[in-house]
């Protein structure tokens, strides 16, 4: 069924394997647990979590965000548009997750686990979306220059960037989880 069109009393195009939904759900919850641990270290290490200067750092970032048009909210829900947005968003977050590596002292392994688990989640979701239109992958050259730019920031901005990435990723995953439970 093309996005935005009604399904007119037709059999659903494919029957899902019974385990795929559970794997996706557990994977997202596992990543969210990892993010919580990383946020704990970030918040303990600096006062970024209470800072009101987030807008300054946010100007440098183009973090994926759920919007009404993406079809992932209860109002205006569109499962196919939404699934494409979730996968596209996760692919766009990968460069930011790469940036997070080496940003943690006591939670270095946790940062790696979040990154690796996200890659696995993308694979699970791509299987679920196999009947949907091709999903655009971020340009590696653009990602490389973004990473360089982020790593060249001063310490305060780097700390703020870390905090904003974790917060945005958490919000994105929570919205994704709610939407995916309907699918």
């Amino acid at each position: 069924v093309p996005p935005g069109e009604d399904s007119k009393d037709v059999a659903a195009p494919h029957r899902q394997p019974l385990t795929s939904s559970e794997r996706i759900d557990k994977q997202i919850r596992y990543i969210l647990d990892g993010i919580s641990a990383l946020r704990k270290e970030t918040c303990n290490k600096s006062n970024m979590c209470e800072s009101s200067k987030e807008a300054l750092a946010e100007n440098n970032l183009n973090l994926p965000k759920m919007a009404e048009k993406d079809g992932c909210f209860q109002s205006g829900f569109n499962e196919e548009t939404c699934l494409v947005k979730i996968i596209t968003g996760l692919l766009e977050f990968e460069v930011y997750l790469e940036y997070l590596q080496n940003r943690f002292e006591s939670s270095e392994e946790q940062a790696r686990a979040v990154q690796m688990s996200t890659k696995v989640l993308i694979q699970f979701l791509q299987k679920k979306a196999k009947n949907l239109d091709a999903i655009t992958t971020p340009d590696p050259t653009t990602n490389a220059s973004l990473l360089t730019k982020l790593q060249a920031q001063n310490q305060w901005l780097q700390d703020m960037t870390t905090h904003l990435i974790l917060r945005s990723f958490k919000e994105f995953l929570q919205s994704s989880l709610r939407a995916l439970r309907q699918m």
Partner: antibody, heavy 119, light 106 residues
Framework: EVQLVESGGGLVQPGGSLRLSCAAS????????MHWVRQAPGKGLEWVAK????????YYSDTVTDRFTFSLDTSKSTAYLQMNSLRAEDTAVYYC????????????WGQGTLVTVSS | DIQLTQSPSSLSASVGDRVTITCSAS?????MYWYQQKPGKAPKLLIY???NLASGVPSRFSGSGSGTDFTLTISSLQPEDFATYYC?????????FGQGTKVEIK
Amino acid sequence: EVQLVESGGGLVQPGGSLRLSCAASGFTFSPFAMHWVRQAPGKGLEWVAKISPGGSWTYYSDTVTDRFTFSLDTSKSTAYLQMNSLRAEDTAVYYCARQLWGYYALDIWGQGTLVTVSS
Amino acid sequence: DIQLTQSPSSLSASVGDRVTITCSASISVSYMYWYQQKPGKAPKLLIYDMSNLASGVPSRFSGSGSGTDFTLTISSLQPEDFATYYCMQWSGYPYTFGQGTKVEIK
């Protein structure tokens, strides 16, 4: 008032077919996954099937896979369960249920429709 | 499929009693739900995700537990609570239900 109303139940011979309907009213149908759950006379509850809000994904219990088909007509806010190759053990009250947004809970249920498979 | 075993299968209690129903899963489950069903009626959601009270459900109902062992508690049984209670789990499809616990008047 938020409600689901099932219809289409009745007496059918083994091997026969039946199509159940579930009409939704009092809420916006489009964002919710829908389910069928059945209850044999004097027995407990058994989950049968789920369909995603736009009909792209369906899930079935092993007992009905390849015999039952779940579909939607979103323009009519109605879900359907096409039941083929019916067996005596399919005799039950069939409930349709709405899945709570953002959770796996089934929060709104219809009153049920009785399907009797007997010769 | 994950098996859910409820205990007891039935119980007799008086108005005002504290009632506890347990649900044991064959393996660890992701989410647990509790439903109330009265004769000839559809099931009604009481508790979702282990311990969240469904909309419009009185606070005398509560759910707890994790992993394989879960409990539904009615802190002070009311006349309208005499019914059959089912636990239900989701850990991927299929959803499965317990066999039910019938709460009768003593």
